[in-house]
C-alpha cells in the first residue's frame, strides 16, 4: 500500500445567492468552511475503493462533493451518477494537489443517490464512492421548551420535545444595570437540562437543533421593581405548563411570599419557595407558581403579596389554540423618494410568531419588538424606495396572518419611447400615474405646439416589478403624421417629461428626450 | 431645505392663554406626526404633545392634559398649541418637531427635525 | 408611567471611547426603541441614534446605540471636543401613549 495516493473528501455547503442554476465549478454563492469527510478505504472490496462519509443534503441546498489528491504527476477522472458519467475537470491547488469537484446546485430528489468518481493516476487506480441523501426535515420539529420541578428537589428541568434531540441550555443573567444581551459579560450559559440557582435576575431556557433555536423566558414578578403601567400578562394554551416565580429581596428574613389566584390562595402543591441570603446579608425569597397542565379555569390574575413589598398581579389567559390578532386590512402608502418611511404590524400572538417580509418574490428577515401593551411590533424599512406590493405573513403552531401593503413614490414621469411602421408608443412609470399629450412638430409649428388627439390611445398596465404600474400611450399613424416629428408627454403633479419621434419608415427611431419640470 | 419655525411665544400671566405655531416647508406636511417638546430654563427636555399626520390622533403629557390643544392645517402646513390655563410651571423653550419616519407608528423612530423654539414665559 | 434614569454627569478625554446609560424604572427597557438626542447650548435638540442603533444620514460613525434587558447604551468612540453637549434618550411608552425623555447627562470632553 506504499503507492496508494494520501486522498481528502470534502464537503462544501453553500449558502445560495440567487445563483443560476446548473453543474459549474466556479460557484456564484458564498461558501461555509469545507466538512472533512473522512474517506477510507472499504474493506474486502475489488479493486481500491474509498468510501466517503454519508452525506445528508437540505432539500433546494447547494453543495459541492470534492476530493483532494496527494498524488505525483497527472490524474484523469470521471464520474458515474446513476450509470451515466460526467464530465470531470481536475485541476491543482496551491499544494499542487489534484482537486476534483462535483458541485450540485439547489438539490432535489432526482440528485440524490451514489455519486462514483474514477481517478487513474500515473501511479495506481481508484474510486470514490460518496452517497448523497435528501435530509428528511419533514420529520423535524424543534417546540419550545418548557419548565417541569424536579421530583423532590428545589430545581427545574428544562425540557424541548424536539427532532432530533435538542441542545438544551440555561442562559442566565444576574445583571441590574449592565445589558442582558447574549455576548453580554453580564451573561453565564450552561448546557445542561437542570437548573438549581434560581435566584437570578432573568432566567431562560434553550432549546437548539438543525431547525433553529427556541427559548423560554421564565415569567417573573419582581417586587422589588416599580409595576409596568400595564399589568403583565401571560397567555398559555390548554394543557401546557404554568410557571410565574415571584422574587424579593428584604434587609431580613422576616418576610414571607404568598400566591393567590382571583383572591384565593394557590393550592398546596402549586406552589413552592426558595431562600438563601446574598452577598450583602440581605435576603431574597423567591416563591413559584406552577400548574403541571393547565385548563381553562386556571386564567385569571395571580398575585404575589409580601408581608414587607407591595404586591403585583399578572393576568394568565388560557386559550384553547393560540392566534395572531392584527388588522388585516391592506394599507397603500404614497411617499416622496427621499422621505423615510417603515412599513409596521402591531400584532398579539401566542405562541410567539415566526414572520417575514415579502417584495417581489424575495423574502427579507423580520424583525420583532414586544412592546409594554401586550402588542408587539414588526417593522420593515429595508424597502430602498422601491414602489409595490409588500407582503407581512406572520404564522405560529395555530394560526397564519398576511397583510398587504402597496408602496407608490411620488416622482416625475420618465419617458420611453418606441416606433414600428403603424403606431408609436411611449411608456412611463412616474407616480401619480401620468397624462399624456401628443404634438405634432412642423413648419407651422416649430415648437410643437399643435396638439394630436386623433388615434391616441391610453392604457395603465402592470409591470414585472410586482404591483408597480406602468401607463402607456400609443398613437396611430396616419397620412397626415407620416414623415413628420411628434412629441409625446408626460405629466403629473411633480413635472413632464416627453420624447420627440420621428415617424418615417420603419426600424431604429431617433428618439430626443425632453425633460421639462 | 427642510425647516420648522415657531412663532406666537411671549410673556403671559398665570391663568392666561397663548397659541404657538409652527411652519413647516420643505417636506410632505400631511405625512409626518408632529410633536411639541418643550425644556425649561436650565432644565431637561420634556414632551409636552404629539399629533397623527392626518390629525385623527392626538396625545398629551399628563401635565398639559385638559389645558393644552395640539391640532394642525395640513392645508397651510402649519401645527399649533393652543395653551389655556396656563401657570409658572409652563415657562419654558417649546420647540415643534417632526417624526423621523413618514406615517410612522409613535412606537419607532423619534424626531429628526427641530425648530429653533419660542420662549414662553409664565409670570405675573 | 415609567421613568428614564441617566448618569448626571460623564466626562472623557478626547480620543477615548464614553458611554452613557439610559435605564427604565420598571419593566424592560427592551421593549422600547430607543432614541437618543445630542442638544449644545442655546441650541435646539439634534437627533443622533434612532431605532436602538441606527443613524441618521450625517450622524459620524463615532455614535452608536445599543438596547438589551435593562439598559440602553450610547457610546461615542474616538470622543471630541465638539461632542461636549447634553445627551437624553427617549422612548415611546406604549401603555400610556406618551413620549418619554431621560434627564440628560452632560458629556463633559476633558
Known amino acids: 500500500n506504499q503507492d496508494l495516493p494520501v486522498i481528502k473528501c470534502v464537503l462544501i455547503n453553500h449558502k445560495n445567492n440567487d445563483s443560476s442554476v446548473g453543474k459549474s465549478s466556479s460557484y456564484p454563492m458564498v461558501s461555509e468552511s469545507p466538512e472533512d469527510l473522512g474517506c477510507a478505504l472499504r474493506p474486502q472490496s475489488s479493486g481500491t475503493v474509498y468510501e466517503a462519509a454519508a452525506v445528508e443534503v437540505d432539500v433546494s441546498a447547494s453543495i459541492t462533493l470534492q476530493v483532494l489528491v496527494d498524488a505525483p504527476g497527472n490524474i484523469s477522472c470521471l464520474w458515474v451518477f446513476k450509470h451515466s458519467s460526467l464530465n470531470c475537470q481536475p485541476h491543482f491547488d496551491l499544494q499542487n494537489r489534484g482537486v476534483v469537484s462535483m458541485v450540485i446546485l439547489k438539490m432535489t430528489e432526482t440528485q440524490a443517490g451514489e455519486y462514483l468518481l474514477f481517478i487513474q493516476s500515473e501511479a495506481t487506480n481508484y474510486t470514490i464512492l460518496f452517497t448523497v441523501s435528501i435530509r428528511n426535515t419533514l420529520l423535524y420539529t424543534l417546540r419550545r421548551p418548557y419548565f417541569r420541578k424536579m421530583e423532590n428537589q428545589d430545581a427545574l428541568v428544562c425540557i424541548s420535545e424536539s427532532v432530533p434531540e435538542p441542545i438544551v441550555e440555561w442562559v442566565l443573567c444576574d445583571s441590574q444595570g449592565e445589558s442582558c444581551k447574549e455576548e453580554s459579560p453580564a451573561v453565564v450559559k450552561k448546557e445542561e437540562k437542570v437548573l438549581h440557582e434560581l435566584f437570578g435576575t432573568d432566567i431562560r431556557c434553550c432549546a437548539r437543533n438543525e431547525l433553529g433555536r427556541e427559548c423560554t423566558r421564565l415569567f417573573t414578578i419582581d417586587l422589588n421593581q416599580t409595576p409596568q403601567t400595564t399589568l403583565p400578562q401571560l397567555f398559555l394554551k390548554v394543557g401546557e405548563p404554568l410557571w410565574i416565580r415571584c422574587k424579593a429581596v428584604h434587609v431580613n428574613h422576616g418576610f414571607g411570599l404568598t400566591w393567590e389566584l382571583e383572591n384565593k390562595a394557590l393550592e398546596e402543591g402549586n406552589y413552592f419557595e426558595m431562600s438563601t441570603y446574598s452577598t450583602n446579608r440581605t435576603m431574597i425569597r423567591i416563591l413559584f407558581a406552577f400548574v403541571s397542565s393547565v385548563a381553562r379555569n386556571d386564567t385569571g390574575y395571580y398575585t404575589c403579596s409580601s408581608s414587607k413589598h407591595p404586591s403585583q398581579s399578572a393576568l394568565v389567559t388560557i386559550v384553547e389554540k393560540g392566534f395572531i390578532n392584527a388588522t388585516n386590512s391592506s394599507e397603500d402608502y404614497e411617499i416622496d423618494q427621499y422621505e423615510e418611511f417603515c412599513f409596521s404590524v402591531r400584532f398579539k400572538a401566542y405562541p410567539q410568531i415566526r414572520c417575514t417580509w415579502t417584495f417581489s418574490r424575495k423574502s427579507f428577515p423580520c424583525e420583532q419588538k414586544g412592546l409594554d401593551n401586550g402588542y408587539s411590533i414588526s417593522k420593515f424599512c429595508n424597502h430602498k424606495h422601491q414602489p409595490g406590493e409588500y407582503i407581512f405573513h406572520a404564522e405560529n403552531d395555530d394560526a397564519q396572518f398576511t397583510k398587504m401593503f402597496t408602496l407608490n413614490i411620488r416622482r416625475k414621469p420618465q419617458v420611453l419611447a418606441e416606433a414600428s411602421a403603424s403606431q408609436a408608443s411611449c411608456f412611463s412609470d412616474g407616480y401619480p400615474l401620468p397624462s399624456w399629450t401628443w404634438k405634432k412638430c412642423s413648419d407651422k409649428s416649430p415648437n410643437c405646439t399643435e396638439e394630436i388627439t386623433e388615434g391616441v390611445w391610453n392604457r395603465k398596465a402592470n409591470r414585472k416589478v410586482f404591483g408597480q404600474w406602468v401607463s402607456s400611450s400609443t398613437l396611430n399613424m396616419s397620412e397626415a403624421i407620416k414623415g413628420f416629428l411628434v412629441k409625446c408627454c408626460a405629466y403629473n403633479s411633480l413635472g413632464t417629461s416627453c420624447e420627440t419621434i420621428l415617424l418615417n419608415s420603419p426600424g431604429p427611431f431617433p428618439f430626443i428626450q425632453d425633460n421639462i419640470s | 431645505e427642510v425647516q420648522l419655525l415657531e412663532s406666537g411665544g411671549g410673556l403671559v400671566q398665570p391663568g392666561g392663554s397663548l397659541r404657538l405655531s409652527c411652519a413647516a416647508s420643505g417636506f410632505t406636511f400631511s405625512s409626518y406626526a408632529m410633536s411639541w417638546v418643550r425644556q425649561a430654563p436650565g432644565k431637561g427636555l420634556e414632551w409636552v404633545s404629539a399629533i397623527g399626520g392626518s390629525g385623527g390622533s392626538t396625545y398629551y403629557a399628563d401635565s398639559v392634559k385638559g389645558r393644552f390643544t395640539i391640532s394642525r392645517d395640513n392645508s397651510k402646513n402649519t401645527l399649533y398649541l393652543q395653551m389655556n390655563s396656563l401657570r409658572a410651571e409652563d415657562t419654558a423653550m417649546y420647540y415643534c418637531a417632526r417624526d423621523y419616519y413618514a406615517f410612522s407608528d409613535p412606537a419607532y423612530g423619534g424626531m429628526d427635525v427641530w425648530g429653533q423654539g419660542t420662549l414662553v414665559t409664565v409670570s405675573s | 408611567n415609567f421613568m428614564l434614569t441617566q448618569p448626571h454627569s460623564v466626562s472623557e478625554s478626547p480620543g477615548k471611547t464614553v458611554t452613557i446609560s439610559c435605564t427604565r424604572s420598571?419593566?424592560?427597557?427592551?421593549?422600547?426603541?430607543v432614541q437618543w438626542y445630542q442638544q449644545k447650548p442655546g441650541q435646539a435638540p439634534v437627533l443622533v441614534v434612532y431605532d436602538d442603533s441606527d443613524r441618521p444620514s450625517g450622524i459620524p460613525e463615532r455614535f452608536s446605540g445599543s438596547n438589551s434587558g435593562n439598559t440602553a447604551t450610547l457610546t461615542i468612540s474616538r470622543v471630541e471636543a465638539g461632542d461636549e453637549a447634553d445627551y437624553y434618550c427617549?422612548?415611546?411608552?406604549?401603555?400610556?401613549?406618551?413620549?418619554?425623555f431621560g434627564g440628560g447627562t452632560k458629556l463633559t470632553v476633558l
Open positions: 427617549q422612548v415611546w411608552d406604549s401603555s400610556s401613549d406618551h413620549w418619554v
Open positions: 420598571s419593566g424592560s427597557i427592551a421593549s422600547n426603541y
